[in-house]
Amino acid sequence: LEASEEVELEPCLAPSLEQQEQELTVALGQPVRLCCGRAERGGHWYKEGSRLAPAGRVRGWRGRLEIASFLPEDAGRYLCLARGSMIVLQNLTLITGDSLTSSNDDEDPKSHRDPSNRHSYPQQAPYWTHPQRMEKKLHAVPAGNTVKFRCPAAGNPTPTIRWLKDGQAFHGENRIGGIRLRHQHWSLVMESVVPSDRGTYTCLVENAVGSIRYNYLLDVLERSPHRPILQAGLPANTTAVVGSDVELLCKVYSDAQPHIQWLKHIVINGSSFGADGFPYVQVLKTADINSSEVEVLYLRNVSAEDAGEYTCLAGNSIGLSYQSAWLTVLPEEDPTWTAAAPEARYTD
């Protein structure tokens, strides 16, 4: 249907029970007036799942959809639903006259708009085929996990599925990593969820006969704050020859800003521990994680005095973690010595 002056479905009477979807091509700048139901009990108009306000340039008012002057952003799917129910009275798509591709239909190729996709009667409105798989409505998922929502359905003609997030059309274009829509599985998949993915996800399943919808509520749990985590096995026990260079590595993971120190255990008056039970240590290096190479302790031209226990100590606002390693320094003539060193520790 291509109109030249005003797109109008009149009169505003009881709707036809044949809910065939219509496509209307509208020229830019053209006024639109569509009616749905009787004026005094007209249905509510929705665009892409969002109800139109009774005022504004594009408005839904007393059963009428009115657009003062059609703009490219007005193209899309419009539904009129009967008051007090989800019965679809009108189901149509407005297409910009000079751009037939603006119908924004990237849906399942089996869409009922495909003229080659003719269906045998009787027609049947969409229905859920596995409602028991949809029972879990509320989802709380740790950040970084994958979420999959499914709305398996059937009907005749074969329905299409669209997804809304918080009532708005959802294609994932603003989501890092995007989304996967698997129409043959009636599913929406989001990988590596983040807090901004929280919301209400609605699957909207439609065919020419009717539509059904289902909401999933998603909460994303941020990682709980923790003291720094040190990669197991680092720093590693190391054997070096006098005069060589040594690197001790400490890999620190922390959400909160960590502070890192490299310590060398020393002996004072023949003792390794003070009266308080803590070891005597010498601070060799201290910095925040964003300092360059703070996670590496470089020992140049090592001597026998450099042998001993070294500790990587990492702390943040939540707590401390440390792991230790032993450096064994061999005289140049005997590079075959190996040591059974104590295990690395990870404590509060």
């Epitope: 029972e135 709380a140 289902y214």
Partner: antibody, heavy 119, light 111 residues
């Protein structure tokens, strides 16, 4: 034993504010969706709001949207309902309820706290 | 006006059976499971039936639930005086502006 104990109700003038609390015990509070449900005197139950375990996901009934705020402090095992711009029709007993994580029903309810909005 | 429709009252004599209906639409009962809550006089609501027909521990087998299409029902057999209470059906609603909807409640009187 799961226990939910509401507090903070009372008499408030129209346009005033009130904050309800719900102290939870007997379960791992931080892993559950929670809700507020209210019941006007002599009337039926009306759902008010739901909050996710993180506190970052909330939904509200149209009748309170923009006026009420649901929140939680998982470190204190406490659910809150901040009620602003109160109206006479908000007069009700307010219940906090735990939502079952499997099939999303309200499996435990508190005893309720009465909020009266009157001049 | 409640979204789910229940009869305002029901009654029966001790030992009798009674059924309470709950009618909804495709966006609530049609797509979601139904739960029933019992509210004894002066008390908070208590879960009675969940997922259409399941009983929490501690709820007697005299209480049973069922669902068909966009309607549900609660059946109570062998009525006892302590069953006198208000009974509410509830379901999640996938309509455009709703989340959880309740029936208006049915006052059960044991004569």
């Amino acid at each position: 034993e799961v226990q939910l104990l509401e507090s903070g109700g009372g008499l408030v003038q129209p346009g005033g504010s009130l904050r309800l609390s719900c102290a939870a015990s007997g379960f791992t509070f931080s892993t559950y969706w929670m809700a507020w449900v209210r019941q006007a005197p002599g009337k039926g139950l009306e759902w008010v709001s739901v909050i996710g375990p993180s506190g970052g996901m909330t939904v509200y009934a149209d009748s309170v949207k923009g006026r009420f705020t649901i929140s939680r402090d998982n470190s204190k095992n406490t659910l809150y309902l901040q009620m602003n711009s109160l109206r006479a029709e908000d007069t009700a007993v307010y219940y906090c309820a735990r939502i079952n994580s499997g099939s999303s029903h309200f499996d435990y309810w508190g005893q309720g706290t009465l909020v009266t909005v009157s001049s | 006006q409640s979204v789910l429709t229940q009869p305002p009252s029901a009654s029966g004599t001790p030992g009798q059976g009674v059924t309470i209906s709950c009618s909804g639409s495709s966006s609530n009962i049609g797509s979601n499971s139904v739960n029933w809550y019992q509210q004894l006089p002066g008390a908070a609501p208590k879960l009675l039936i969940y997922s259409n027909n399941l009983r929490p521990s501690g709820v007697p087998a005299r209480f049973s639930g069922s669902k068909s299409g966009t309607s549900a029902s609660l059946a109570i057999s062998g009525l006892r005086s302590e069953d006198e209470a208000d009974y509410y059906c509830a379901a999640w609603d996938d309509g455009l502006d709703a989340y959880v909807v309740f029936g208006g409640g049915t006052k059960l009187t044991v004569l």
